[in-house]
Structure formats: structure tokens, C-alpha cells
Amino acid sequence: QVKPCDFPDIKHGGLFHENMRRPYFPVAVGKYYSYYCDEHFETPSGSYWDYIHCTQNGWSPAVPCLRKCYFPYLENGYNQNYGRKFVQGNSTEVACHPGYGLPKAQTTVTCTEKGWSPTPRCIRVRTCSKSDIEIENGFISESSSIYILNKEIQYKCKPGYATADGNSSGSITCLQNGWSAQPICINSSEKCGPPPPISNGDTTSFLLKVYVPQSRVEYQCQPYYELQGSNYVTCSNGEWSEPPRCIHPCIITEENMNKNNIKLKGRSDRKYYAKTGDTIEFMCKLGYNANTSILSFQAVCREGIVEYPRCE
């Protein structure tokens, strides 16, 4: 059983002799009727009228009336499309003079049921000037002096120089507030590789392959190790500044205390970690007497070494 077609709802148009025909609906597949389109609309064949067919899948064409959009005259733009007709669904590029463009940096307009979207017009847009670019040890080969918003330009570094990420060329982009960055061409010999490793410590960030001068990297020591020196290194003239040292802690073990018949004063730790410079207070175990000087019971940790007092 083939589904018949109900009365067609033709947006922006209608059937000829609509009121006479309405009582005879729904109609069988195969029937066709003449219809018209309103002003500013046309049939898919480009006429103001055509036939609409009842098919197994409903009315054909599905969109009987399509919007016509005529391309307007562009102030501050190239007018190769001026007066040309576009149909609903068609898009076209808008070519504006340098320094002008569509709003929101768009480049195309589309003919929609309601007309052009966005409206084809060329407004003053943000531009960047070549004269605002300072490039040392490199060059820009592009000939323009003014660049529109979002325009990317390439620059090249002279032999022996490279961009921050080690390449021989780079790019900058014209943004709302000017150029995205100034071109950087650094003497390859001034850059640094990854900073050096240190014993019992590590860097706090993901290390890169190449660092530009004045880059800083932070180090940290393993737990209980003490950082000596600056916790940052800086890249300068192709070399890193002196990295810090991680000084061994003193590990006070129950084994060593038992050997000397001593215990920690005021603590019951079986294992105790002390940093360089820390004072560790000991006392004799019950029933034992000091065999070393009273000062030795206030031992000082020196780079992992501690001298234990002794009790007999």
C-alpha cells in the first residue's frame, strides 16, 4: 500500500488554484501540480513556477522554493561577484581590499532562507605592519608591508642561527593585539641542550632537547637529601650554570646505636634521618655510662657522616 500525499505546505510559495484543489487531497503517487514561488524565491530549476510531484517518498522537490540572493556592491572590496545571483545553500568567498574583511574574520558568505549570512560587507579589520617586526640575524622574504588579522608569515634565520625550537625558519601570526611574537633567531652556539643530571636529585619539569639563552630549569633533591647551591640553573652562552648538589642525610640506625649502647634522646625511632648541619642528641641506654666526651652526645651530621658517642 503506497502512502498518498497530503496537501503540500509550500514555504514561500503555493499551488496555483490552491482553494479549488484543497478538497481533493490526499492524492495518489504520480500526481503533479503546478506551483509558484514568492518574490525573492525561485524553484530548483530557476523559474518562478514549476511542477511538484507526489512520490513514494513524499513531495518532490522537498524544498520547492529556494531563496535568491544577489551579491551586493562591496565598498572596500573586489566586485567580481557584483550583481551575480546565488541560490539558497550556495556559498562564496568575499574578497576585500587589504586592511578590510568580513566581521569576525570570516571569509565566506552563504545564501540562506533569510538572505546572506553574514551580510557581504568589507569593514576595517585589525592589521599588522611589517615595520613592527624586529628581526635580528634573520629575514622575512614576503613583499607585503601590511598583513590582515590571522595572517601567518614565515621568517628565516641566517646560517648559524636558529629559532627557539631549533629550526632554521619560524612563523608569526597577526593577532588582535599585534604580532603573536617577535621572530627569534639565536646563535646556535648560545643554546643549551638538556641540563645536566645530579646525584640524588632531579629536575622538576619535563626536559627539552634545546633551551634558549636565559632559560631556567629547577632541581629538587630526593627525600632527606639537602639541596646545596641554587635550585635553578640558567642557560647562558651555550652552557648551564653550576647545578646544585644533593647532600646525603645521616641515617641513624638502631643497629649502630645498639653497638654503642646509646639511644636517641627524646625519641623512640628505630631509624632516623638527619640533614647536614642537624644536631642529633643521644643518651646512654639504661645501665650504661658515657665512654666519650659529653660534647659527643650532641653529634652533628656532616654530609652523611655522624660520629656516634659510646657508652660502656
Epitope: G193, P194, F206, L207, L208, K209
Partner: antibody, heavy 121, light 106 residues
């Protein structure tokens, strides 16, 4: 053309140390590249373990850092991985890889063929 | 740690058709993203680096796009040798891989 070849024991006991070496041929380990270790558990995805530069600088996966030792031997043109206190979850194919020449950080363009390591008693 | 999420987990496509694989980063990785292809019993192979640059010897049917957190690998017309597992990897901050997308014959 640089080639990488992993070698090491295929079986390691639980709580033991997994030791692997990656031999670099057709190029120098002292080039401007990071030399990495990546593993793939059976039927699973890829996991980056860590990497070393010829100067001895390393990057390691934070969650594995305490168990991972990566070293480089420039005289033998090779780098090594030690993974301590292993358990069954460390059973995987272990790959060594090299990152691309170029920028500050790059993708892996050369891989070894991988070596299967099983952790079992 | 930056988490990379690939979708779909499995993609079934007929030879000659287009395949689109997605990869999302939990935070911006700029353009520091690579795509790898892995076939059973083989090591991964680099296809795309810098989000959109084809590696040496990779056919033009492979293309990458995106930046920041959203990336796409497109294979314009699938050949029989393209059916494999594909991984994305960020190398902006440490290095992490996505869980992979299996591309299978429909």
C-alpha cells in the same frame, strides 16, 4: 639508517630487577636525540617509561620514577633500562625508541623490534 | 599527567572508504601530537608528527589535523594494509599515549 636492538633476559622473578640494553647502530648515541623506553603489556596499549640524552639527563614517567634507572654508555653506543621491584604487571614487550631530530620536543621516528619480558617465579 | 583519549575504540570501515579517528587531550598539548600505526607482532610506526606533518615515506592518504586538545587522523581511501591499531601520543609535557583505535575491515 639508525637501527635499534633490544636485548636482555626474557624472564625475571617477582621483586627482582628487570635489565635491558638497547644497542644503537648506523648512527651515534651522542646525536641530538632522546633515547626512550616504551612498553606494551599483552593486548594493551603503549606506555612510555622514560628517556635519556647522551649527557645522562633523563625524563621518566612520574608514576614509575622511583623504580626506573636509565643509563647511557657512549663508548658502547648503547643505553640501558633497569626496573627494580618488578611484579606481574611489569610483564610486557619492551621497546627502545629514538625521537626525531629537530625541535625542543619530538615524536619517536625509530623503534627497536621489541623484546618480551615475563615476570614470573 | 596529560591523559589522551581516543575514539572510537574500534572502527569498522570498508576498503576504499574514508576513516576518521579522534584523539582528545585532557589539557592543551599545542601541536605536539603524533599518530602511530601498529600491526600485530610489529613495533609502532610514526605516521604524523606536529599534529599534521606526514613522516618520511607515509602515503598522502594519511592526514592529521587539530591543535590544543582536539586532534583527528584521516585516512582518505582505505587500503588493505591500513587495517591496524592506531595510537595518538602527546609529547608536550612528559609523553603519554592514547589507548588506541582498532581499525577493522567492514
Amino acid at each position: 639508517q639508525v637501527q635499534l636492538q633490544e636485548s636482555g633476559p626474557g624472564l625475571v622473578k617477582p621483586s627482582g630487577t628487570l635489565s635491558l640494553t638497547c644497542a644503537v647502530s648506523g648512527g651515534s648515541i651522542s646525536s641530538s636525540n632522546w633515547w626512550s623506553w616504551v612498553r606494551q603489556s599483552p593486548g594493551k596499549g603503549l606506555e612510555w617509561i622514560g628517556e635519556i640524552y647522551h649527557t645522562g639527563s633523563t625524563n621518566k614517567k612520574p608514576s614509575l620514577k622511583s623504580r626506573v634507572i636509565i643509563s647511557v654508555d657512549k663508548s658502547k653506543n648503547q643505553f640501558s633500562l633497569k626496573l627494580i621491584s618488578v611484579n606481574a604487571a611489569d610483564t610486557a614487550i619492551y621497546y627502545c625508541a629514538r625521537d626525531r631530530e629537530g625541535g625542543t620536543t619530538e615524536a619517536f621516528d625509530i623503534w627497536g623490534q621489541g623484546t618480551m619480558v615475563t615476570v614470573s617465579s | 599527567e596529560i591523559v589522551m583519549t581516543q575514539s572510537p575504540a574500534t572502527l569498522s570501515v570498508s576498503p576504499g572508504e574514508r576513516a576518521t579517528l579522534s584523539c582528545r587531550a585532557s589539557q592543551s598539548v599545542s601541536s605536539n601530537l603524533a599518530w602511530y600505526q601498529q600491526k600485530p607482532g610489529q613495533a609502532p610506526r610514526l605516521l604524523i608528527y606536529g599534529a599534521s606533518t606526514r613522516a618520511t615515506g607515509i602515503p598522502v592518504r594519511f592526514s592529521g589535523s587539530g591543535s590544543g586538545t582536539q586532534f583527528t587522523l584521516t585516512i582518505s581511501s582505505l587500503q588493505s594494509e591500513d587495517f591496524a591499531v592506531y595510537y595518538c601520543q602527546q609529547y608536550d609535557n612528559w609523553r603519554t599515549f592514547g589507548q588506541g583505535t582498532r581499525l577493522e575491515i567492514k
